[in-house]
């Protein structure tokens, strides 16, 4: 426990935020499921928000959702429709810095 605390303290002194991998563009078919992955790491652990065409993503029960993952965040859209087309952007912040990545879903 003591060493864990020391490691945490060291990390807190050296805050960082990194986009580990740019988001990919995704082309898929109607009715299928698309997943967009926001791969970021940081200290403190970053807060991640999702945007579609510059607006906060509207979650829909059983169809469109996002969740935290080990590597950052994943946005999943089931039963895809043409209306889902657009620019999807994840924005991550650790309270000091901001990084973002954008992908196109078509």
């Amino acid at each position: 426990p003591t060493s864990s605390w020391n490691i945490s303290s060291e990390l807190n002194k050296d805050s960082y935020l990194t986009l580990d991998e740019p988001m990919n563009n995704i082309t898929t078919s109607l009715g299928q499921t698309a997943e967009l992955h926001c791969k970021v790491s940081g200290n403190p652990p970053p807060t991640i928000r999702w945007f579609k065409n510059d607006a906060p993503v509207v979650q829909e029960p059983r169809r469109l959702s996002f969740r935290s993952t080990i590597y950052g965040s994943r946005l999943r859209i089931r039963n895809l429709d043409t209306t889902d087309t657009g620019y999807f952007q994840c924005v991550a912040t650790n309270g000091k810095e901001v990084v973002s990545s954008t992908g196109v879903l078509f």
């Epitope: 563009n25 082309t27 945007f51 579609k52 065409n53 510059d54 607006a55 906060p56 993503v57 509207v58 043409t82 209306t83 889902d84 087309t85 657009g86 620019y87 952007q89 954008t102 196109v104 078509f106």
Partner: antibody, heavy 119, light 107 residues
Framework: EVQLVESGGGLVQPGGSLRLSCAAS????????IHWVRQAPGKGLEWVAV????????LYADSVKGRFTISADTSKNTAYLQMNSLRAEDTAVYYC????????????WGQGTLVTVSS | DIQMTQSPSSLSASVGDRVTITCRAS??????VAWYQQKPGKAPKLLIY???SLYSGVPSRFSGSRSGTDFTLTISSLQPEDFATYYC?????????FGQGTKVEIK
């Protein structure tokens, strides 16, 4: 400076065809959605079609699906709207417009080109 | 398709007046609404994007706001060059449907 310039409009008979061009400059054409929007005389704006040139992905309004084809030539930085089986109700000023990345809003528009479908 | 119901269809106002135009979306479009100004014989011009963000070069008398699925364009003090037709557009879902337009005329 960003510019979009349409051409190709004119008078055509019902059932005829026309191809509109939208020449783009001043930005990386491949990475922006390019739209066609039309406006019938004295009426409001109607979205027609969109293309994402990097891959050629396309979508159409129901009113033109199967009759109009949107395409792009990234080597010429130009988008096209091929209009077949034209009807009187297709008479309008046709604008091409660029998306304000990554918003869905259209920030740059061409000057428009008039398409008149009449016998 | 999502419907954007814009009101009023026309209004008469004087220079210096405060003008408000509203659009209601038939379902959630988050904050993805744009407003355009169009003058006769000209292409539309972007004024507001993402419901409330002022586009570059647009005078600060123009502003946008959102309350749920209701969106408002406000011109705080109408100027002579503001007499035109205004359109809203939802930009969240395809197709990016437009409102019917509001013509702002001189009283």
């Amino acid at each position: 400076e960003v510019q979009l310039v349409e051409s190709g409009g004119g008078l055509v008979q019902p059932g005829g065809s026309l191809r509109l061009s939208c020449a783009a400059s001043g930005f990386t054409f491949s990475y922006y959605f390019i739209h066609w929007v039309r406006q019938a005389p004295g009426k409001g704006l109607e979205w027609v079609a969109v293309i994402y040139p990097d891959g050629g992905y396309t979508l159409y309004a129901d009113s033109v699906k199967g009759r109009f084809t949107i395409s792009a030539d990234t080597s010429k930085n130009t988008a096209y709207l091929q209009m077949n089986s034209l009807r009187a109700e297709d008479t309008a000023v046709y604008y091409c417009a660029r998306i304000y990345y990554p918003s869905g809003a259209m920030d740059y528009w061409g000057q428009g080109t008039l398409v008149t479908v009449s016998s | 398709d999502i419907q954007m119901t814009q009101s009023p269809s026309s209004l008469s106002a004087s220079v210096g007046d405060r003008v408000t135009i509203t659009c209601r979306a038939s379902q959630s479009v988050s904050s993805a609404v744009a407003w355009y100004q169009q003058k006769p014989g000209k292409a539309p011009k972007l004024l507001i994007y993402s419901a409330s963000s002022l586009y570059s070069g647009v005078p600060s008398r123009f502003s946008g706001s959102r309350s749920g699925t209701d969106f408002t364009l406000t011109i705080s003090s109408l100027q002579p060059e503001d007499f035109a037709t205004y359109y809203c557009q939802q930009t969240y879902w395809y197709p990016g449907t437009f409102g019917q337009g509001t013509k702002v005329e001189i009283k």
